[in-house]
């Protein structure tokens, strides 16, 4: 039994069969910049007089405005089948989330099962190393953090175009530099199953002591 079935309470509607959205695809996994289409559908028997339009929601918030959705109606002698189509062109990471449909039937709100949309792409930096001025031969730290999906994201550190660590570290990564005698440029490489993203290069300057 589908838990989304409405609990009708009025005397006239007690005999109405339960209505619920059909089960969804479940989980869509795709790469950034691809197009995606999905739908939810519901069969409304003729015995139901009052139905409102289908609205699309993502992560608990209604999707309004520029989103591309179409609702199709297929009537037959028993009622009407309604299919709500949703499409996203050139998906971005911000399109990640749980999508679902809502509609009102006989003044009762019905919610579909979610469709999980997982957009995968190259690692995305949320923390990159920053330029600092350091005292000669004094230890300092640099931080690099990148995320997927897909996870995990592995980090290589680069100093003056040469890799510092032979084995990658899982993001987030902190590089402890024991000290420098001259200016150097540091960056980090973030790797996941989709490929490689390189951070900005940062100059670490040696403070001149007067």
């Amino acid at each position: 039994a589908h838990t989304a079935a409405p609990q009708v309470t009025s005397t006239a509607s007690k005999l109405l069969p339960p209505v619920a959205f059909n089960h969804t695809i479940g989980h869509i996994v795709l790469s950034e910049h691809k197009n995606v289409k999905f739908n939810c559908s519901i069969n409304i028997p003729n015995t139901y007089q009052e139905t409102a339009g289908i609205s699309w929601w993502k992560d608990g918030k209604e999707l309004l405005g520029a989103h591309h959705s179409i609702t199709q109606f297929y009537p037959d002698e028993e009622g009407v089948s309604i299919i709500a189509l949703f499409s996203i062109a050139s998906v971005q990471r911000s399109d990640n989330g749980s999508y679902f449909c809502k509609m009102k039937v006989n003044n009762r709100e019905i919610v579909s099962d979610p469709i999980y949309v997982e957009v995968q792409g190259l690692p995305y930096f949320i923390k990159q190393p920053e330029s600092v001025n350091v005292t000669r031969n004094t230890a300092f730290n640099l931080t690099c953090q990148a995320v997927g999906p897909p996870e995990p994201v592995n980090i290589f550190w680069v100093q003056n175009s040469s890799r510092v660590n032979e084995k990658p570290e899982r993001s987030p990564s902190v590089l402890t530099v024991p000290g420098l005698t001259e200016t150097a440029v540091f960056s980090c490489e973030a790797h996941n199953d989709k490929g490689l993203t390189v951070s900005k290069g940062v100059h670490i300057n040696i403070k001149v002591i007067p």
């Epitope: 989304a4 969804t24 989980h27 869509i28 989330g97 979610p114 999906p149 899982r170």
Partner: antibody, heavy 116, light 110 residues
Framework: QSVEESGGRLVTPGTPLTVTCTVS????????MGWVRQAPGKGLEYIGF?????NTYYASWAKGRFTISKTSTTVDLKITSPTTEDTATYFC?????????????WGPGTLVTVSL | DVVMTQTPASVEAAVGGTVTIKCQAS??????LAWYQQKPGQRPKLLIY???NLASGVPSRFAGSGSGTQFTLTISDLECADAATYYC????????????FGGGTEVVVK
């Protein structure tokens, strides 16, 4: 990214126990977390899930027996009134997304023993 | 809650061989199914999600298929390191139907 459970110990039946999961390298405001247990020599058993905004979902058998809550870096599983059947290794695991209950990072588990 | 039924409970195969594990859901779960590998004394490891997507670092010898109520995990070119117990798990609308695991399948490699 890592998760680690703590707080497993020997308790007597009926004594509430809280097991804690500490996470690092990711944010609980982005990812959901699940709890799964495994009795000695048995299979995996799903207990429940807390999503990124704090909504909790439980397996039917677990409702009322367990409570899941979280802070910014920890997720707690409270066993409200343990019985000997609750003796198991308890795992916490990171969900694939905010509301997605497949688990891509698991802790090593913590053993809870309920005995007189 | 959805109930997941996994078969067989145990299977034995030779190195280089192929093993097929089946998982049946008590109702349609779309493709919201994951497979895990667990070795004795270790934590489970995600192998496959969304029924057929390989998790990071998992060799392509592992393959998942199916949708709706019937799912399959196939391990080809078996290696000794594949000896483990394998579990399926639904995460379809986990807020409504739970995240039940199958009973597990022990794979013995000869």
């Amino acid at each position: 990214q890592s998760v680690e459970e703590s707080g497993g110990r020997l308790v007597t039946p009926g004594t509430p126990l809280t097991v804690t999961c500490t996470v690092s390298g990711f944010s609980l405001s982005v990812y959901g977390m699940g709890w799964v247990r495994q009795a000695p020599g048995k299979g995996l058993e799903y207990i429940g899930f807390i999503n990124n905004v704090g909504n909790t979902y439980y397996a039917s058998w677990a409702k009322g027996r367990f409570t899941i809550s979280k802070t910014s870096t920890t997720v707690d599983l409270k066993i409200t009134s343990p019985t000997t059947e609750d003796t198991a290794t308890y795992f916490c695991a990171k969900g694939g997304g905010g509301d997605w209950g497949y688990f891509n990072i698991w802790g090593p588990g913590t053993l809870v023993t309920v005995s007189l | 809650d959805v109930v997941m039924t996994q078969t067989p409970a145990s299977v034995e195969a030779a190195v280089g061989g192929t093993v097929t594990i089946k998982c049946q859901a008590s109702q349609s779960i779309g493709n919201a199914l994951a497979w895990y590998q667990q070795k004795p004394g270790q934590r489970p490891k995600l192998l496959i999600y969304a029924a057929s997507n390989l998790a990071s670092g998992v060799p392509s010898r592992f393959a998942g298929s199916g949708s709706g109520t019937q799912f399959t995990l196939t391990i080809s070119d078996l290696e000794c390191a594949d000896a483990a117990t394998y579990y399926c798990q639904t995460y379809y609308a986990i807020n409504r139907y739970g995240g039940a695991f199958g009973g597990g399948t022990e794979v013995v490699v000869k």
